[in-house]
C-alpha cells in the first residue's frame, strides 16, 4: 500500500502569531499555542520523517486579527509560501475585501494552487481571474500523483463580498464533473479540500463518486480519537468515517480553527487508489513545540507595522461613546448602538431585489462592551481605543433563529435585571419594551423587528414561527452569558469578521460618528 500523510489547517483567521489557549492574544508565552513559526517546526519535522506529505489549507486564512486589517492578505501569501503549502481552498472570508482584495495580495502572490470547483467567474472578471484559481490540481507526491479538488460555501455571497461576477454553485453538482475529469486523467487518489462546513463535508464524502478523502473547514469542527489534549470537545472521531453511496469508507477531517492544531491524517492506498486504512489525530501546537527561529524573526519584522497602525486615527467621534457597564448592562447605550450599527453595515449584501438586505437585526451582550471612549481627546478613535472596548478577539457572526428563540433570548436578557450582569442585550434593528414588574420569563411586552423583505424598512411584531437572520457575537452564538437557547436552537451559524475590524471599518467609512440613545430599548410599567 502507498502511504500518504495529509497535514491540514483550516479557519486560521489571521493567527500568524502564537495565541493563548482560547486563541486570543498571547499573554504568557510559556502557555501559548499555534502561530506559523510553531506550525513550521512541526511540519518540517514530519516532512523529514515521512516520505509522502501534503500540507493543505481548507480556507479562511483571511480575517481575524490586526494582521489582516493592516496587511490585507499579503501576510497570508508570504507566510503560506514560507511554509510551502501544497494547496489551499478558497473560504468565504477570502472575499472580505472583494475580489480585488483576493486577486492582488493572495492569488497573484501564492506559490501554491488555490482551488474552488464551484466558483465560476463571469463577465469581465472571467478573463481577469482566469488561471489564478483552479477547480482542481494534480500534485506529484513521490512517484505518485494526487488530485486535489476544491470547494467553497455557496453561502459566500451572504457572508462576504464576492461581487456580482462570481457564481457560487452547489458543491456536489460542481465537484462531480471535476472528479470525473481527474479519473479520465488516470488520477485515482482524490482529496476534496474545501470550505463549506462539516455537514457538507460529510455529504460530499457520501455523494461525490471518486472522492477518497475530504479535508474541510468553515464549521471549526474539532475531531479527535482518544482523550483530547486541550479544551475543545470532539464532535466525533478523527477521521470521521462516512460510508459513500457506492459503499466506500471515506475519511472526513477538519482541524478546529485558529492554527491551534495541525491536522495529521495517514492514508494507505492500494494499487487501484482505494483507501485501505486511515488514521491520525490533530496535533496540538503547544509550547512543547519550539517556534522556528527564522519564521519567528520574519514575524517580528512584519509585526513592527502593526504596532504603528494601532495608534493611528481611524475616524472621529463628536459624542461621548458610553461603553460603561453602568449604562450598557442596564439600558440602551450609544456604544452598543454604534457597534450594532457597524455589525449590520458590515453585512449589507444586496443579493435579491425583494430584500433591501438579507439581515436587519443585531444583538450584543452588554457585558461584551468593556470600555467607553471619551470624545474630549480631539475626538480621535484608534484601533487601540477599540481594543479596549472589544478586548476578547471575537467575531460578529450570522445566525438563523426562530422568533421563539429570540423571544427567549430577550427574556433571558432581563431575567435577573439590576445586578449588573452581562446578559443585558444591546440591539440594532429591534425595538424591545420590558416590564420589570412582571415575573422573570414574562417581561418582554413588546418586540418589534425591522423588516428585510421590504423597500422601506419598518418595524413589525416578531413572529414566533418565522426564521430570522441575526448578527451577534460568536460568544452569544456559542451560548455565552447563559444564552443556551441560542446555541441549542440556532438553525444555522456562520462565523463572521473580527469584532474590532467591523467597528474600525465602519468608523473609517463614516469618518465622523455621533451615535445616540434613540429608544431601541424601553421600559414600561403595567399597560404600555
Amino acid at each position: 500500500a502507498w502511504e500518504l500523510t495529509i497535514l491540514h489547517t483550516n479557519d486560521v483567521h489571521s493567527r500568524l502569531e502564537q495565541t493563548s489557549e482560547d486563541s486570543s492574544k498571547c499573554v504568557n508565552a510559556s502557555r501559548c499555542m499555534g502561530g506559523v513559526a510553531r506550525l513550521f517546526t512541526k511540519v518540517q519535522q514530519i516532512r523529514r520523517a515521512e516520505p509522502n506529505v501534503l500540507l493543505l489549507d481548507a480556507g479562511d486564512q483571511y480575517q481575524g486579527t490586526i494582521w489582516f486589517t493592516v496587511y490585507k492578505g499579503a501576510e497570508v501569501a508570504h507566510f503560506m509560501n514560507a511554509l510551502r503549502y501544497d494547496a489551499m481552498a478558497l473560504g468565504n472570508h477570502e472575499f472580505d475585501n472583494g475580489v480585488e482584495g483576493l486577486i492582488e495580495p493572495l492569488l497573484k502572490e501564492a506559490k501554491f494552487p488555490i482551488l474552488s470547483a464551484n466558483i465560476k467567474a463571469k463577465g469581465p472578471l472571467a478573463s481577469q481571474i482566469s488561471g489564478l484559481y483552479l477547480p482542481y490540481k494534480v500534485l506529484p507526491v513521490g512517484d505518485e500523483v494526487v488530485g486535489i479538488v476544491g470547494y467553497t460555501s455557496k453561502e459566500t455571497p451572504f457572508l462576504s463580498n464576492p461581487g456580482t461576477n462570481l457564481v457560487f454553485e452547489d458543491e456536489i453538482t460542481a465537484l462531480q464533473p471535476e472528479v470525473d475529469k481527474l479519473k479520465t486523467l488516470n488520477v485515482n487518489k482524490i482529496i476534496a479540500l474545501g470550505h463549506s462546513g462539516f455537514e457538507m463535508d460529510k455529504l460530499i464524502a457520501q455523494k461525490v463518486r471518486g472522492v477518497d478523502v475530504v479535508v474541510g473547514g468553515h464549521s471549526n469542527t474539532f475531531l479527535y480519537t482518544g482523550n483530547p489534549p486541550s479544551k475543545e470537545v470532539p464532535a466525533g472521531k478523527y477521521p470521521f468515517i462516512v460510508t459513500s453511496d457506492d459503499g466506500r469508507k471515506v475519511p472526513v477531517v477538519q482541524a478546529y480553527a485558529f492554527g491551534k492544531y495541525l491536522g495529521y491524517l495517514k492514508i494507505e492506498f492500494d494499487e487501484r487508489g482505494n483507501v485501505i486504512s486511515s488514521h491520525g489525530n490533530p496535533i496540538l501546537l503547544n509550547s512543547s513545540i519550539p517556534e522556528d527561529p527564522s519564521i519567528k524573526a520574519d514575524i517580528n519584522k512584519w509585526r513592527i507595522k502593526l504596532d504603528n497602525y494601532s495608534t493611528q486615527e481611524l475616524g472621529k467621534t463628536i459624542v461621548y461613546l458610553d461603553g460603561s457597564s453602568q449604562s450598557c448592562r442596564f439600558r440602551e447605550c450609544n456604544m452598543g448602538n454604534l457597534i450594532c450599527d457597524a455589525m449590520i453595515n458590515n453585512n449589507l449584501r444586496h443579493t435579491d431585489e425583494m430584500f433591501w438586505n438579507h439581515v436587519s437585526m443585531c444583538i450584543l451582550n452588554g457585558g461584551g462592551i468593556r470600555s467607553p471612549i471619551d470624545e474630549r481627546n480631539n475626538g480621535t478613535i484608534t484601533w487601540e481605543n477599540l481594543a479596549a472596548v472589544l478586548p476578547f478577539g471575537g467575531t460578529f457572526d450570522l445566525v438563523q433563529l426562530k422568533g421563539s428563540t429570540l423571544k427567549k433570548a430577550f427574556e433571558h436578557s432581563v431575567h435577573r435585571y439590576g445586578q449588573s450582569t452581562g446578559e443585558f442585550l444591546q440591539v440594532g434593528g429591534i425595538h424591545v419594551v420590558y416590564d420589570l414588574s412582571r415575573k422573570p420569563g414574562d417581561r418582554v411586552v413588546k418586540l418589534d423587528v425591522l423588516c428585510t423583505k421590504c423597500r422601506v424598512p419598518s418595524y413589525d411584531p416578531l413572529k414566533m414561527d418565522e426564521v430570522y437572520k441575526v448578527i451577534l457575537p460568536n460568544f452569544l452564538a456559542n451560548g455565552g452569558d447563559g444564552f443556551q437557547m441560542i446555541k441549542d436552537e440556532l438553525l444555522r451559524h456562520d462565523s463572521g469578521d473580527q469584532d474590532i475590524n467591523v467597528v474600525s471599518t465602519y468608523i473609517s467609512k463614516m469618518k465622523v460618528i455621533y451615535p445616540a440613545v434613540e429608544g431601541r430599548i424601553k421600559f414600561s410599567t403595567g399597560s404600555h
Epitope: 459503499g247 492500494d270 494499487e271 487501484r272 486504512s277
Partner: antibody
Framework: QVQLQQSGAEVVKPGASVKISCKAS????????INWVKQRPGKGLEWIGK????????DYNGNFKGKATLTADKSSSTAYMQLSSLTSEDSAVYFC?????WGQGTLVTVSA | DIQMTQSPSSLSASLGERVSLTCRAS??????LIWLQQEPDGTFKRLIY???SLDSGVPKRFSGSSSGSDYSLTISRLESEDFVDYYC?????????FGGGTKLEIK
C-alpha cells in the same frame, strides 16, 4: 486497469530451486507492496511475505525465511519469488497480489 | 501472529437466501480486513476492503461489517455465481493471516 501476470507452471526436482515471476501493469509499480501467497489443497492460504519495489524492502513470514527470496526489477515492473531446497511440501499454487488485485497463480510441482 | 478463525468452513444455502460468514481476530486489527472470493478456476477477486468498503464492480448484495473482534461478510440474496469459496485476510500486522475459508454450496 491493474493486472498482475504470473509465469507458467513449473515441475521441479526435490532439492532444486525455482524462480517465478509476476509482471505488473496499470499502476506505479514502485509505490506498492507486492505480496506472495501459497495455497495448498486442504491447507488454506499462507502469506509468504511482501516486497516494496521502490527500495527493495522486504518483510517475510518467519515460516518462509530461508525458503523464499523476494526481489523486484523496477525497469520491467516485475516481482520475483525464488523458492529454494524444494520438497514435496512446497508443491502448491503461488499467487502474487497487491492489496486489490491478484495474479492468476503459478502451480509449482515438486516431483522426483 | 494474529489468528483469524473463519466460520463456518462450509455452508449449504438456497438461491435468494441471506447468508453471513464470520472471521474472528485473536487480536485487535483495527478494521484492516479484506474479504476475497475464489472462483473454481483458482482466480481471486477482492470483494470488501477496510472491513466494509465495497470494491468497484462488486454487486451491492455483498456487504461487510464488524462488531468487536468479529468481522462479517453478508450476502443479502444469493445468486448462482456466489456459490464459491470465501476467505478473510487481516493486513493489520505482519505476518498477514487468512481465515481458513468458507465453501458456499447450493442446497
Amino acid at each position: 486497469q491493474v493486472q498482475l501476470q504470473q509465469s507458467g507452471a513449473e515441475v521441479v526436482k526435490p532439492g532444486a530451486s525455482v524462480k517465478i515471476s509476476c509482471k505488473a501493469s496499470g499502476y506505479v509499480f514502485s509505490s506498492y507492496w507486492i505480496n506472495w501467497v501459497k495455497q495448498r489443497p486442504g491447507k488454506g492460504l499462507e502469506w509468504i511475505g511482501k516486497i516494496f519495489p521502490g527500495n527493495g524492502d522486504t518483510d517475510y513470514n518467519g515460516n518462509f525465511k530461508g525458503k523464499a527470496t523476494l526481489t523486484a526489477d523496477k525497469s520491467s515492473s516485475t516481482a520475483y519469488m525464488q523458492l529454494s531446497s524444494l520438497t514435496s511440501e512446497d508443491s502448491a499454487v503461488y499467487f502474487c497480489a497487491g492489496f486489490a488485485d491478484w495474479g492468476q497463480g503459478t502451480l509449482v510441482t515438486v516431483s522426483a | 501472529d494474529i489468528q483469524m478463525t473463519q466460520s463456518p468452513s462450509s455452508l449449504s444455502a438456497s438461491l435468494g437466501e441471506r447468508v453471513s460468514l464470520t472471521c474472528r481476530a485473536s487480536q485487535d486489527i483495527g478494521e484492516r480486513l479484506i474479504w476475497l472470493q475464489q472462483e473454481p478456476d483458482g482466480t481471486f477477486k477482492r470483494l470488501i476492503y477496510a472491513t466494509s468498503s465495497l470494491d468497484s464492480g462488486v454487486p451491492k448484495r455483498f456487504s461487510g461489517s464488524s462488531s468487536g473482534s468479529d468481522y462479517s461478510l453478508t450476502i443479502s440474496r444469493l445468486e448462482s455465481e456466489d456459490f464459491v469459496d470465501y476467505y478473510c485476510l487481516q493486513y493489520a500486522s505482519s505476518p498477514y493471516t487468512f481465515g481458513g475459508g468458507t465453501k458456499l454450496e447450493i442446497k
